[in-house]
């Protein structure tokens, strides 16, 4: 099928158009013994010369000026459907005095190199050689759309053919499709759809959950404003042109919601005063997690039930809970939030702190000399239960004996029962400095402030005790 097309579709004058759904076979002289050759010009891509005429400076033996060289006019506009084949050519007659003429093909200002089906055929005569350069595409695609020209180089002159415009028509092609979105419930949002031909125009219909949204089509591009959704929906757009319709990908529009609680919580490590936990976040409710909250309460049924709350960033799903009591049981729950709100708290899990070394020293340390038995008696009060940080297994007593020129330190371990001890006098006429620390399986606590007592030489009597005051008694 051939038909003339009006010129204004493309810039520049050209003799006519061919609309075809088959390979156009142009009538060519078929000289016997033609020489097909693949010829590609080494010329660099560049703007073609305006016009298609060159007047060579070379003259014949008789110095007769040669006629101007020009490509013959050919079809100017070919319209065809995608995947069809097309063949077009340009021809020129060149006086035989010119050697090594090459024809190159250019598309939209760029030379076509490589694996294109370009064949140049030569038909020599007495004075001139007819050269026909054919270009064929077996299955056209949209990317083949454009303006094709031939270029010939003779004696550093460039001869340029008229353009041949190839217009590949097909189903609408999407240049912009709707995108998946996560939106707030009952909040308006926009979706965009854009498709192109040729052929134009392209009309757009919107589809929501398999039902058309607009009864009348909109010209591409189209923006759909959705006033708001209460539940998830799938949107797509249909693009129609004279060749048929193309449907975009379906995109899911999700409604943002509060997240689900974490699916796992792990107790990574426990110390006397801290617990390291990690968690696996639940479903994010289509909105990124912002932060998480760790709720901690004492598991002891007799506790007052108050909840400690520790806020942390959503990443890295890890938190060290600090300032906890030693050797205590805790219930822990984790909750995370996004822009919509907080998740429910995870199921409560149990975790325990370990035993620690006591955090305070024994109180009211008193030291006095029992001269009759040549002993030093020591008395104290055990640290407050809350600060024992475990089960007391005993005490460590440090006593340092200092007299002129000598100093020696001794350590004693005593059992947890009672709060007194007796140590033998090591040196007379010396100062004894006593310090006591409480001991649990978690370690040795801090030593008490030093208490000094003077041990006189034999025969002196001094029963006055030395002591450290209990807190608040000073």
């Amino acid at each position: 099928r051939e038909e003339a097309k009006p010129y204004p579709l493309f810039p520049g004058p050209f003799p006519g158009s061919l609309q075809t759904d088959h390979t156009p076979l142009l009538s060519l002289p078929h000289a016997s013994g033609y020489q097909p050759a693949l010829m590609f010009s080494p010329t660099q891509p560049g703007r073609p010369h305006t016009g298609n005429v060159a007047i060579p400076q070379v003259t014949s033996v008789e110095s007769k000026p040669l006629p101007p060289l020009a490509f013959k006019h050919t079809v100017g506009h070919i319209i065809l459907s995608e995947h069809k084949g097309v063949k077009f050519n340009c021809s020129i007659s060149v006086p035989n005095i010119y050697q090594d003429t090459t024809i190159s093909w250019w598309k939209d200002g760029k030379e076509l190199l490589g694996a294109h089906h370009a064949i140049t055929q030569f038909y020599p005569d007495d004075e001139v050689t007819a050269i026909i350069a054919s270009f064929s595409i077996t299955s056209v695609q949209r990317s083949d759309n454009g303006s094709y020209i031939c270029k010939m180089k003779i004696n550093n002159e460039e001869i340029v053919s008229d353009p041949i415009y190839i217009e590949v028509q097909g189903l609408p092609h999407f240049t912009k499709q709707p995108e998946s979105m996560n939106v707030t419930r009952n909040t308006a949002f926009n979706l965009t759809c854009q498709a192109v031909g040729p052929p134009e125009p392209v009309n757009i219909f919107w589809v929501q959950n398999s039902s058309r949204v607009n009864e009348q089509p909109e010209k591409s591009p189209s923006v759909l404003t959705v006033p708001g959704l209460t539940e998830m929906a799938v949107f797509s757009c249909e693009a129609h042109n004279d060749k048929g319709l193309t449907v975009s990908k379906g995109v899911q529009i999700n409604i943002k919601a509060i997240p689900s609680p974490p699916t796992e919580v792990s107790i990574r490590n426990s110390t006397a005063h801290s617990i390291l936990i990690s968690w696996v976040p639940g479903f994010d409710g289509y909105s990124p997690f912002r932060n998480c909250s760790i709720q901690v309460k004492e598991a002891d049924p007799l506790s007052n039930g108050s909840v400690m709350i520790f806020n942390t960033s959503a990443l890295p799903h890890l938190y060290q809970i600090k300032q906890l009591q030693a050797l205590a049981n805790y219930s822990i729950g984790v909750s995370c939030m996004n822009e919509i709100g907080w998740s429910a708290v995870s199921p409560w899990i149990l975790a325990s702190t370990t035993e620690g070394a006591p955090s305070v020293a024994p109180l009211n340390v008193t030291v006095f000399l029992n001269e009759s038995s040549d002993n030093v008696d020591i008395r104290w009060m055990k640290p407050p239960t809350k600060q024992q940080d475990g089960e007391l297994v005993g005490y460590r007593i440090s006593h340092v004996w200092q007299s002129a020129g000598i100093s020696k330190e001794l350590l004693e371990e005593v059992g947890q029962n009672g709060s007194r001890a007796r140590i033998s006098v090591q040196v007379h006429n010396a100062t004894c400095t006593v310090r006591i620390a409480a001991v649990t399986r978690g370690g040795v606590g801090p030593f008490s402030d030093p208490v000094k007592i003077f041990i006189p030489a034999h025969g002196w009597v001094d029963y006055a005790p030395s002591s450290t005051p209990a807190p608040g008694n000073a």
């Epitope: 919580v265 792990s266 490590n269």
Partner: antibody
């Protein structure tokens, strides 16, 4: 839609091995612990083991050594490798999603809170 | 290993009846409440009914309720419906142990 589909069951001779698969859709194995449970014909449910989101596994004492749980998160599939099969292993094998799980890494154990989504099961018959 | 014992093992009842199933644990359940109830119909997979001893799973009718703590738990169906004839299992976990124990099951059948 969230779904679990077991496969790989069938007739197997005593002493043989079999690998069951549990294909997960609608949620990710990297965010949820998963479990295997079996049910002998006419009997009750029996827990086999669990694989946490990070890949740690815990098994019932009777299953240790013969049954191994693994997963391929890229395929969103969990597996149960069963070796040295016996007639008493004949059962329907279910995979189930663990709704919540607490792990005690330092002590190498973990506790299931609930199994909130189950597959339809696959029958394994061990017989000569 | 800890054990969960359900009673009765079989229960005959009529539509509209109030039904109670008990589940006793040989030691305290983790956190005293990490006990779940499952419903299973012949040839089908179990379905979660109740977790945390008393919380209803999503989509479960309100005629189902659970109670209990520590070692004693109860599942109650306030008014038995035709769709409720099935086998019910309790299950739970324990501190210091990965095992997830199931009760022996209670079959609720039509009287």
């Amino acid at each position: 839609e969230q779904q679990l589909v077991e496969s790989g069951g069938g007739l197997i001779q005593p002493g043989g091995s079999l690998r069951l698969s549990c294909a997960v859709s609608g949620f990710s194995l990297s965010s949820n612990a998963m479990s295997w449970v079996r049910q002998a014909p006419g009997k009750g449910l029996e827990w086999i083991g669990i694989i946490s989101s990070s890949g740690s596994t815990y098994s019932a004492s009777w299953a240790k050594g013969r049954f191994t749980i693994s997963k391929d998160s890229s395929k969103n599939t969990m597996y149960l490798q069963m070796n040295s099969l016996r007639a008493e292993d004949t059962a329907v094998y279910f995979c189930a999603r663990v709704g919540f799980f607490v792990g005690y890494g330092a002590y190498d154990y973990g506790i299931i809170h609930r199994l909130d989504l189950w597959g339809q099961g696959t029958l394994v018959t061990v017989s000569s | 290993d800890a054990q969960l014992t359900q009673s009765p093992s079989t229960l005959s009842a009529s539509v509209g009846d109030r039904v109670t199933i008990t589940c006793q644990s040989s030691k305290s359940i983790y956190n005293n409440n990490w006990l779940s109830w499952y419903q299973q119909k012949p040839g089908k997979a179990p379905k979660l009914l109740i977790y945390d001893a008393s919380d209803l799973a999503s989509g479960v009718p309100s005629r189902f309720s659970g109670s209990g703590s520590g070692t004693e738990f109860t599942l109650t169906i306030s008014s038995l419906q035709p769709d409720d004839f099935a086998t019910y299992y309790c299950a739970g976990g324990y501190s210091g142990d990965s095992d997830y124990a199931f009760g022996g099951g209670t079959k609720v059948e039509i009287k």
